[in-house]
Interface confidence: low
């Protein structure tokens, strides 16, 4: 049959070479001459020439040896042909396989593999794969079966067995306890590979196994005992700093230090934080310390780390005495600011009060007083005792310096400490009215018609404080009752004014008498601008004489110039009398005193 | 009125120990510290260390370590320092001082001095 | 250990003098510098503390002042009383140290 079963040729042949492998041989060969060829790669085709058949005979020839790693099977086509070329069998499939020798030795895909492993692990614990190849079959043969072993770890501690790697799949675990990164930080394996399944060729790498650090360590306090003196009512003042020291890899989390007080700090004085760069644990006061109230602070404070203890490990703590120094601090007023009630207008040298200091030191130190604002200089105050005396009239009433009947004094306290210090009180004198002004009365000018004038309703003000004021009673002094009345209402708080008697145009002085309920009397004089109109006016109508008729103050210069108009007016006055023939009391005074004065003025 | 009384002279003899007492009155003897203070003839004034009678603790100056021992009697109000193996190098008037509440600060009152002489 | 250096060792000075003692620390000591008065007797007072503050019962003819490394306790107005010799002492370090020694005596 034109048929050929797959033909199997070792790889790295010795030859001689052509070497026969089989012969192709067609059945046709009884009729005719045969001629035989082959095609495919390594035949008439790259890589050509590696077989050739004999043309004649059939025989199947290898020219050079072979390399399986190269090319594993060969794929060829063998065909016959008669004499006259013509083809007298299909082409036949020739398969050629190269079968392994073991010729390649394993090799490690990394000549140094890097691993990890965290410390203090438990046997069995994965730590890295390593691989080998092996261009060898590993599939019909053992020629490129690889088997991986540990040759030798460095350094031996705490032995020399501390990993394992498995045979097949080069995967390397812990096979031992103690790993302990402190102490040996990174080991270096070196590791096998050996074809043939641990029988034949040998190569060798390095695995290098990292310990990664766990937190096995507590921070612990070099020193563990501390003592520091902190100033007194300093709030932020740094008390003092504490070390630690730890194994852990630096500036982990398992070497960061966290501190906390646990003890000693019952009034929250204090607080610790973690300095960022040093590791060091920072504790200042978060209040001002006492030294009077307590002159000493024993602290314990704990240290841990960020991380967890990976394991059960002891807590480290420090205990810190705190010595709080003696600051000279300054007086205190008690109380800070003083309430005091008052007699205003007490004579001068009368006590008002006495104001003293507290000194928080306990050291009997002296404290003198003086003061330190008195806007009205009302007051003095003894340096010793603290006594505070009159030296001016406390005036109520007095605007500038009273608000809302209270006068207020800054004092200050100083001690004879070194250096000393000085503290600062406020004295609120409340003045208690004294019945020391009289009613006035507002407006103390009017504008009144003579004819049907319009009464004057005048509002009354008194500085005093009930019961010092209203109800008010009104009198009419210097003959002033002659021409007006005044008469207060039935509240007591306005004095109306009434003309009751014509008087001519003029400016006049109404002498008026008001006093309070505590009979407090105060005279005034109210200007009063009576005019020659009827019922209500604001001004005088037109121009008017300000002579000094009727108690009125003159004019002065001003009457010179207005006598001009009133001489030039005069005449049309008499004229206007004349014709009406009419001639009232108070214009016959009017005009006499016109003409005297234009006679006045002429000569 | 604050009072530190000390117990009277001592001569002994070289290799000895001896024990000087101190005595506190009119304070709260266990909440300051007590220190001790050597004088040599016709020298200054060493700080030797010091005791919390309150808890016991005690700080020394370096060069005292192994020297002297120093302990406390809250009940009795009593501090004591202990000066063992004895040269006449130790011959000194020793002082116990109180301090003004904060340590190695200020020492506020003082105890009359007791002599020790150490001779053969 | 903090050096505290005392001048003079000592001096002679007329009742009615103002005299003044130095004493100088090896680094800065934040003014926790005290003064003890040592009378021929052998007893010791504090006489002032934290650089000028004056101990309870002390005269006001003691003062003291400086700051830094240098310090001084001044006597205004010497009486015979105050024959002694006069120590500082620093409060700032671990140990404490004292200086050296000034003996005062009358002309």
């Known amino acids: 049959d034109w048929v050929v079963a797959p033909i199997s040729v070792p790889e790295n042949g010795k030859g001689p070479f052509p070497q026969r492998l089989n012969q192709l041989k067609s059945n046709k060969d009884r009729d005719t001459k045969i001629f035989y060829s082959i095609t495919g790669p390594g035949a008439d085709s790259p890589p050509e020439g590696v077989f050739a058949v004999e043309k004649e005979t059939g025989w199947l020839l290898l020219n050079k040896p072979l390399d399986r790693e190269e090319i594993a099977k060969y794929e060829l086509f063998g065909h016959a042909v008669s004499e006259n070329g013509a083809s007298v069998e299909d082409p036949m499939n020739i398969s050629i396989i190269v079968t392994d020798q073991n010729d390649h030795k394993p090799k490690f895909t990394q000549d140094t593999f890097r691993g990890s492993v965290l410390e203090g692990v438990l046997p069995g614990t994965s730590v890295m794969q390593v691989t080998a190849t092996d261009e060898d079959d590993a599939i019909y043969t053992y020629n490129g079966v690889v088997a991986y072993s540990i040759h030798s770890q460095e350094p031996k501690d705490p032995h020399d067995l501390m990993f394992t790697i498995h045979r097949s799949t080069g995967t390397i675990s812990v096979i031992s306890s103690g790993l302990d990164r402190e102490k040996v930080p990174e080991y270096t394996l070196t590791i096998q590979a050996t074809d043939m399944d641990g029988d034949g060729s040998t190569t060798t790498a390095v695995a290098v196994v990292e310990i990664l650090d766990a937190n096995d360590n507590a921070p612990m306090f070099e020193p563990q005992k501390y003592e520091a003196w902190v100033p007194e009512n300093e709030v932020g003042h740094e008390v003092q700093r504490l070390t630690v020291t730890d194994l852990d890899v630096p500036n982990s989390p398992a070497w960061r230090a966290t501190y906390h007080i646990v003890g000693g700090d019952d009034g929250d004085h204090f607080t610790i934080t973690t300095h960022p760069e040093t590791n060091q644990g920072v504790l200042t006061t978060k209040k001002g310390l006492d030294f009077e109230a307590q002159d000493q602070h024993t602290l314990y404070v704990e240290v841990t780390n960020e991380a967890p203890f990976a394991v059960k490990l002891p807590t480290a703590t420090a205990t810190v005495v705190v010595h709080v120094k003696d600051v000279n601090e300054a007086p205190v007023f008690v109380p800070p600011s003083k309430v005091v009630e008052v007699q205003e207008g007490i004579p001068t040298g009368e006590p008002v009060c006495v104001y003293t200091a507290e000194d928080p030191d306990k050291e009997n130190q002296k404290i003198s007083y003086r003061i330190l604002r008195d806007p009205a200089g009302w007051l003095a105050m003894d340096p010793d005792s603290g006594q505070v005396t009159a030296v001016g009239t406390l005036d109520r009433e007095d605007e500038q310096f009273v608000r809302n009947n209270i006068y207020e004094v800054m004092v200050l306290a100083m001690d004879n400490g070194s250096p000393p210090t000085t503290g600062t009180g406020t004295l609120l004198l409340t003045l208690i009215d004294v019945n020391d002004h009289g009613p006035v009365p507002e407006p103390r000018q009017i504008t009144i018609c003579n004819q049907s004038p319009v009464r004057q309703v005048l509002n009354i003000t008194d500085k005093d404080l009930s019961p010092h004021t209203s109800p008010f009673q009104a009198q009419l002094t210097d003959d002033s009752d002659i021409y007006w009345t005044a008469e207060v209402n039935e509240e007591g708080d306005t004095v109306v004014l009434s003309l009751k008697k014509f008087l001519k145009q003029d400016t006049y002085d109404v002498h008026l008498s008001l006093s309070d309920h505590g009979n407090k009397e105060q005279l005034t004089v109210i200007r009063a601008t009576v005019c020659d109109c009827h019922g209500h006016v604001e001004t005088c109508p037109g121009p008017w004489k300000g002579g000094s008729g009727g108690g009125g103050s003159g004019a002065g210069v001003i009457a010179v110039i207005v006598v001009v108009v009133i001489a030039i007016v005069a005449g049309i006055v008499v004229l206007v009398i004349s014709r009406k023939k009419r001639m009232a009391k108070y214009e016959k005074a009017e005009i006499k005193e016109m003409g005297e004065m234009h006679r006045e003025l002429n000569a | 009125v604050q009072l530190v009384e000390q117990s009277g002279a001592e001569v002994v003899k070289p290799g000895a120990s001896v024990k000087i007492t101190c005595k506190a009155s009119?304070?709260?003897?266990?909440?300051?510290?007590m220190n001790w203070v050597r004088q040599r003839p016709g020298k200054g004034l060493e700080w030797i260390g010091h005791?919390?009678?309150?808890?016991?603790?005690?700080n020394y100056n370096g060069k005292f370590k192994g020297k002297v021992t120093l302990t406390a009697d809250k009940s009795s109000n009593t501090a004591y320092m202990q000066l063992s193996d004895l040269t006449p190098e130790d011959s000194a008037v020793y002082f116990c001082?109180?301090?003004?509440?904060?340590?190695?600060?200020?020492?506020?009152?003082w105890g009359q001095g007791t002599t020790v002489t150490v001779s053969s | 250990e903090l050096v505290m250096t005392q001048t003079p060792s000592s001096l002679s000075a007329s009742l009615g003098d103002r005299v003044t003692i130095s004493c100088r620390a090896s680094?800065?000591?934040?003014?926790?510098l005290n003064w003890y008065q040592q009378k021929p007797d052998g007893t010791v007072k504090l006489l002032i503390y934290?650089?000028?503050r004056l101990h309870s019962g002390v005269p006001s003819r003691f003062s003291g002042s400086g700051s830094g490394t240098d310090y001084s306790l001044t006597i205004s107005n010497l009486e015979q009383e105050d024959i002694a010799t006069y120590f500082c002492?620093?409060?700032?370090?671990?140990?404490?140290?004292f200086g050296g020694g000034t003996k005062l005596e009358i002309k």
């Open positions: 001082a109180r301090d003004r509440g904060s340590f190695g600060a200020w020492f506020a009152y």
């Open positions: 009119g304070y709260a003897f266990s909440s300051y510290w």
């Open positions: 005791i919390y009678p309150g808890d016991g603790d005690t």
């Open positions: 680094q800065d000591i934040s003014n926790y």
């Open positions: 934290y650089t000028s």
């Open positions: 002492q620093q409060g700032n370090r671990n140990p404490p140290t």
